[in-house]
Interface confidence: medium
C-alpha cells in the first residue's frame, strides 16, 4: 500500500515517504512547481472506544506514522504521493481545470460497449501489475526483513491490489506466531464504513481510467434492492452465472470462472507470522444464498433507511441504533432499529451472495463487489444531498479505532481523513444516475447533478 | 519452524540476581511480543508480562513490577528476563513464548 | 485486572468419555481467549485461539465455544494422550491472567 519508490532502506529508516517529481532530484514532492512539500504527517491521536484496548500493538494506530512521519502534502487541487495527480474532480496540467464529473450508471443500462469496457477493464486489472504501488509482506517491525537490508513488498496486480487494501483494513491484530487478537476493523462496523469504501472505489475507478486511457470512465452500480431470491447480475454476460457441475464456483463461459482470490487464508497468516503476499488461493466462489429463501433487500428498505436523519449514533459502533450509516452498512435493520438476528442492505447482500462474499477480508475478490459497494455508495450519496450534514455529524472522538472524523484512512496513502470524504460525489468528481424512486410520493428519478 | 530456546536450569541464593535467556528462531523476532510466565511446582500458571523486542515496550503484570525487568537483544534474537532479590517463592519454572509457541522453561531453585 | 475462573478444578474420566471445561472471564473479553494443554514436565502448547479456532496440528475432538464472559473447551471421545492440566487465558489487554487450571485424570 506504498509507493514503490519508497520502499527503500533509505526511505523505511529514515520513514520518510517523499518522492522528486520527474527527473530533477530537488523536484520532492513538486516543490518547484509549487505542487506541494516534505512535512510532517499529522494523525490522530483522540481516544477511540470499541473493543479494541490495546496501545502500541498494531500498525495501523496512528496511521501511517508506524512506517512513515514525513510524506507530501500538496497544495491546492495538487494530489498523489508526489503530488503529480490532482485531486478528484480535477484535470489539466495544473490541476486548474474541474472536470465533469464522470457519471454512474445502473449496470443494467450500459450499453453492450460500455458493459464490454467495464468487464475488460476488471480483467485487465487482475492482469496488469500496478504501475505505482506494492504490497507489504511483513509487519511493521519485520519491514526490513531479517538483516535490516531487504525491504519486505510484493508486487501486485491493480485489482489485487484493491482486494489487498480492504483485506489489511480488516485483518488481526497480530501479537504473536498464531496469536490473533480479533477486534478490529477500520472499515466496518462503524462511520468510516461509508468513507472507507467510497475512497476504495474512487481508486480503483482511478486506477481503471488509466489502464484503459479514458478519463470519463465510471463504475457502474449493481441496484441490488430488488427483494428477490436470485442474483440478476449473476449471468454470463455480467459477473458469471452458477457452474452446473458445482455451482458454487462460477461459468466457465465467464471471464470470472477463472480469477483467483488473494488474501483469504487468515489462519495462514496468523500462523506463519506474515500478511497476505498476493499469491494465488483458488478459485473464486459464491454460493447464492437465494435458493435457501434468503432474500435480497428491498426499495421500502432503501426507503426507510434514508429517512434516518442522524448519520451514526453513540457508541458509533455495530449496535448503533437509529443510525443511517449502521442500518445501511446493515448491522441494525433498515429502519433503525436493532435485532441480533436480522442483516439488512450492505451485509445481507454480501451474506446473499455467499462464498468469496461472506467474510470482510475476502470479499473484494469477487467483481460484485465494485457494483455492490457502488450501489451503497449511492445511498450514502443521496442521504449526504438530502440532509446536507455538518463536519460534526460525524464524532471527533470515541468511535472505534479508525472511525474517528480525523483518522486516516488505513491503509491508504497518502493519508487522507475521514472528513475529506464525508462530501456529496459530486464534489468528489462524480455522480450517479440513478432510476430508483426514494420516498412513496415521489416520482422515478434521482437527481444526478 | 518456530522455535524458542530457554537457558538452563538455575540453583540461586536467596538475595541474589539471575538473567534468564530465550532465543528464538524461525520469525520475525522484532515485530512480536515476547511473554514470560511462571509456574511454581504443583500450581497454576502466572502471566509475568511481555516485551515487544524491535521497539523495546513492555508490559507488566504489576505483582512482579520491581522483581522481573524484560531486555532484547535483536542482533541474537534474545530476550531476558532478570529476577532480583530472589527469595524461595521465585522457586519456579519459568517459560518464554510468542503467540502459539512457548519455549521448553527453565526451572529456578532458590536456596540457602 | 481480569479474573478468570476455571471449573471444574480436576476431573477423573475414563477413555471415551466426552468433556467440557469452563472458562469465566469477569468482564467481556470479547473471545480473546486461548486454550492450553500441558503434560507432566511439558510446556503448555496451544489447542485453541480466539475462542473457536483450532490450533494447527491440534485434533478435531477438541472444540472451542463461547463469547462475552462465558467460554468452553469440549473434548469428544477422550483418549489417553488427552490426560494432563489444561488451562484458558485472556489476551484482553494485560496482564493476559490465566484460569486456575482443570487437572483431567484417568479414572
Known amino acids: 500500500q506504498f509507493p514503490r519508490v519508497c520502499m527503500t532502506v533509505d526511505s523505511l529508516v529514515n520513514k520518510e515517504c517523499c518522492p522528486r517529481l520527474g527527473a530533477e532530484s530537488a523536484n520532492v514532492c513538486g516543490s518547484q512547481q509549487g505542487r506541494g512539500q516534505c512535512t510532517e504527517v499529522r494523525a490522530d491521536t483522540r481516544p477511540w472506544s470499541g473493543p479494541y484496548i490495546l496501545r502500541n500493538q498494531d500498525d495501523r494506530e496512528l496511521w501511517p506514522r508506524k512506517f512513515f512521519h514525513r510524506t507530501c502534502k500538496c497544495t491546492g487541487n495538487f494530489a498523489g504521493y508526489n503530488c503529480g495527480d490532482c485531486k478528484f474532480g480535477w484535470t489539466g496540467p495544473n490541476c486548474e481545470r474541474k472536470k465533469p464529473p464522470v457519471i454512474r450508471q445502473n449496470i443494467h443500462s450500459l450499453s453492450p460497449q460500455e458493459r464490454e469496457q467495464f468487464l475488460g477493464a476488471l480483467d485487465l486489472a487482475k492482469k496488469r501489475v500496478h504501475p505505482d504501488y506494492v504490497i507489504t509482506t511483513q509487519h511493521w517491525l519485520g519491514l526490513l526483513g531479517p538483516n535490516g537490508t531487504q525491504p519486505q513488498f510484493a508486487n501486485c496486480s491493480v485489482y489485487d491490489f484493491f482486494v489487498w487494501l480492504h483485506y489489511y483494513s480488516v485483518r488481526d491484530t497480530l501479537l504473536g506466531p498464531g496469536r490473533p487478537y480479533r477486534a478490529i476493523d477500520f472499515s466496518h462496523q462503524g462511520p468510516a464504513f461509508v468513507t472507507w469504501h467510497r475512497y476504495h472505489l474512487l481508486c480503483l475507478e482511478r486506477d481503471l481510467q488509466r489502464l484503459i486511457g479514458n478519463e470519463s470512465f465510471a463504475l457502474p452500480y449493481w441496484n441490488f434492492a430488488t427483494g428477490r431470491n436470485e442474483c440478476d447480475v449473476c449471468t454470463d454476460q455480467l459477473f458469471g452465472a452458477a457452474r452446473p457441475d458445482d455451482p458454487t464456483l462460477i461459468s466457465r463461459n465467464s471471464r470470472f470462472s477463472s480469477w483467483e482470490t488473494v488474501c483469504d487464508s487468515l489462519d495462514d497468516y496468523n500462523h506463519l507470522v506474515t500478511l497476505c503476499n498476493g499469491t494465488y488461493e483458488g478459485l473464486l466462489r459464491r454460493n447464492q444464498m437465494g435458493r435457501n429463501s434468503m432474500k435480497l433487500p428491498t426499495l421500502k428498505d432503501i426507503r426507510d433507511c434514508l429517512s434516518l436523519q442522524k448519520f451514526d449514533n453513540p457508541p458509533f459502533f455495530q449496535n448503533s441504533t437509529f443510525s443511517f450509516r449502521n442500518a445501511l452498512e446493515g448491522f441494525d435493520k433498515a429502519d433503525g432499529t436493532l435485532d441480533s438476528q436480522v442483516m439488512s442492505l450492505h451485509n445481507l447482500v454480501h451474506s446473499f451472495l455467499n462464498g468469496t462474499n461472506a467474510l470482510p477480508h475476502s470479499a473484494a475478490n469477487d467483481p460484485i463487489f465494485v457494483v455492490l459497494h457502488s450501489f451503497t455508495d449511492a445511498i450514502f450519496d443521496e442521504w449526504m444531498k438530502r440532509f446536507n450534514p455538518p463536519a460534526d455529524a460525524w464524532p471527533q472522538e470515541l468511535a472505534p479505532i479508525g472511525h474517528n472524523r480525523m483518522y486516516n484512512m488505513v491503509p491508504f496513502f497518502p493519508p487522507v481523513t475521514n472528513e475529506e470524504l464525508f462530501l456529496t460525489s459530486d464534489q468528489l468528481g462524480y455522480s450517479y444516475a440513478i432510476d430508483l424512486p426514494v420516498s412513496v410520493e415521489e416520482t422515478p428519478g434521482w437527481p444526478t447533478t | 519452524q518456530v522455535q524458542l530456546q530457554q537457558s538452563g536450569a538455575e540453583l540461586m541464593k536467596p538475595g541474589a540476581s539471575v538473567k534468564l535467556s530465550c532465543k528464538a528462531t524461525?520469525?520475525?523476532?522484532?515485530?512480536?511480543?515476547i511473554e514470560w510466565v511462571k509456574q511454581r511446582p504443583g500450581h497454576g500458571l502466572e502471566w509475568i508480562g511481555e516485551?515487544?523486542?524491535?521497539?523495546?515496550?513492555?508490559n507488566y503484570n504489576e505483582k512482579f513490577k520491581g522483581k522481573a525487568t524484560f531486555t532484547a537483544d535483536t542482533s541474537s534474537n534474545t530476550a531476558y528476563m532478570q529476577l532480583s532479590s530472589l527469595t524461595t517463592e521465585d522457586s519456579a519454572i519459568y517459560y518464554c513464548a510468542s503467540g502459539a509457541y512457548w519455549g521448553q522453561g527453565t526451572l529456578v531453585t532458590v536456596s540457602a | 485486572d481480569i479474573q478468570m475462573t476455571q471449573s471444574p478444578a480436576s476431573l477423573s474420566v475414563s477413555v471415551g468419555e466426552t468433556v467440557t471445561i469452563t472458562c469465566r472471564a469477569s468482564e467481556n473479553i470479547y473471545s480473546n481467549l486461548a486454550w492450553y494443554q500441558q503434560k507432566q514436565g511439558k510446556s503448555p502448547q496451544l489447542l485453541v485461539y480466539?475462542?473457536?479456532n483450532l490450533a494447527d496440528g491440534v485434533p478435531s475432538r477438541f472444540s472451542g465455544s463461547g463469547s462475552g464472559t462465558q467460554y468452553s473447551l469440549k473434548i469428544n471421545s477422550l483418549q489417553s494422550e488427552d490426560f494432563g492440566s489444561y488451562y484458558c487465558?485472556?489476551?484482553?489487554?494485560?496482564?493476559?491472567?490465566f484460569g486456575g487450571g482443570t487437572k483431567l485424570e484417568i479414572k
Open positions: 516485551i515487544l523486542p524491535g521497539s523495546g515496550s513492555t
Open positions: 524461525g520469525y520475525t523476532f522484532t515485530g512480536y511480543w
Open positions: 487465558q485472556h489476551f484482553w489487554g494485560t496482564p493476559y491472567t
Open positions: 480466539a475462542a473457536t
